[in-house]
């Protein structure tokens, strides 16, 4: 998966969408699905959605979790339905974590 090039006609997956960027929809279609957790205004905020552009997902999905944000990505229809991103626990290191699930 490391340096996989985007296909000419990339496969699109249906993803659960829960977040402001989803507008009035409960689902979206993209090259990758994601589930994220961030700390906003001192509150935990979970979001789900999709990356329509391969490069956008590639960058975000390879970002290791930090104390304020974690993203888990997957490929497959509705693959993010039962994924819950988690923030790193204190004292745990995440060497080379990519939080990427291929389904």
């Amino acid at each position: 998966m490391e340096d996989e090039k985007p296909k000419v006609n990339p496969k699109l997956y249906m993803c659960v969408c829960e977040g402001l960027s989803c507008g009035n929809e409960d689902h979206c279609e993209g090259q990758q699905c994601f589930s994220s957790l961030s700390i906003n205004d001192g509150f935990h905020v979970y979001q789900k959605g999709c990356f329509q552009v391969y490069e956008q997902g590639k960058m975000t999905c390879k970002t290791p979790p930090s104390p304020g944000q974690a993203v888990e990505c997957c490929q497959g229809d509705w693959c993010n339905r039962n994924i819950t991103a988690q923030l790193p626990t204190k004292g745990k290191s995440f060497p080379g974590t990519q939080n990427f699930h291929l389904e």
Epitope: E18, L20, N24, D26, D41, F43, V45
Partner: antibody, heavy 120, light 108 residues
């Protein structure tokens, strides 16, 4: 400091409309949804609908579809809820509420409430 | 579509543990959020995402969610905890659902 400040109490006649405002401060207006929740005297909380200012379009609870209109004015960071064809059962306190930035699942901040009385 | 059911009232003695339940079909599939409302005031978020506590909410408030039931637990209940409590879930962009509310009475 997040604040939601609502307009004052209203007394309306059956069949008329009411428009309640909710001015938001603290945080970027376009980065959260504004919801409207009502509470009839002695009753529980009832979600009416929401608007994401960035998108401009609103979602409504089925019960209020066709009778409620939620709008937002980004220039003044104000959301509005208009309820038409009022009847006595619409007598309630109407609250606006929002989550923290980007959140859609719960309400972290509430307005003080606006009492709307429908009486002939 | 999910509906949430709460007991209309719960009574507890000061210092004791109060448990307020919220039941709904397959509720564990959703995240439960809890609000406290005192007479004449707007609701206040006390627990969100089943068991997370906003800053400023006392540690005696906790939550859980399993099976068909979410539970708000108040340990060492104090007189100031007397209020109405509502559970809520996000069902879809068109549906935020509240339970009917539970009046918590602190005896004595």
């Amino acid at each position: 400091q997040v604040q939601l400040v609502q307009s004052g109490a209203e007394v309306k006649k059956p069949g008329s409309s009411v428009k309640v405002s909710c001015k938001a401060s603290g945080g970027t207006f376009s980065s959260y949804a504004i919801h409207w929740v009502r509470q009839a005297p002695g009753q529980g909380l009832e979600w009416m609908g929401r608007i994401i200012p960035d998108f401009g379009t609103a979602n409504y609870a089925q019960k209020f579809q066709g009778r409620v209109t939620i709008t937002a004015d980004e220039s003044t960071s104000t959301a509005y809820m208009e309820l038409s064809s009022l009847r006595s059962e619409d007598t309630a306190v109407y609250y606006c509420a929002r989550g923290p930035t980007q959140a859609i699942h719960y309400f972290a901040y509430w307005g003080q409430g606006t009492l709307v009385t429908v009486s002939s | 579509d999910i509906e949430l059911t709460q007991p209309p009232s719960v009574s507890v003695s000061p210092g004791q543990t109060a448990s307020i339940t919220c039941s709904g079909d397959n509720l564990r599939k959703y995240s439960a959020h809890w609000y406290q409302q005192k007479p004449g005031q707007a609701p206040v978020l006390v627990i969100y995402y089943d068991n997370k506590r906003p800053s400023g909410i006392p540690e005696r408030f906790s939550g859980s969610n399993s099976g068909n039931t979410a539970t708000l637990t108040i340990s060492g209940t104090q007189a100031e905890d007397e209020a109405d409590y509502y559970c809520q879930v996000y069902a879809s962009v068109h549906r935020m659902v509240f339970g009917g509310g539970t009046k918590l009475t602190v005896l004595g």
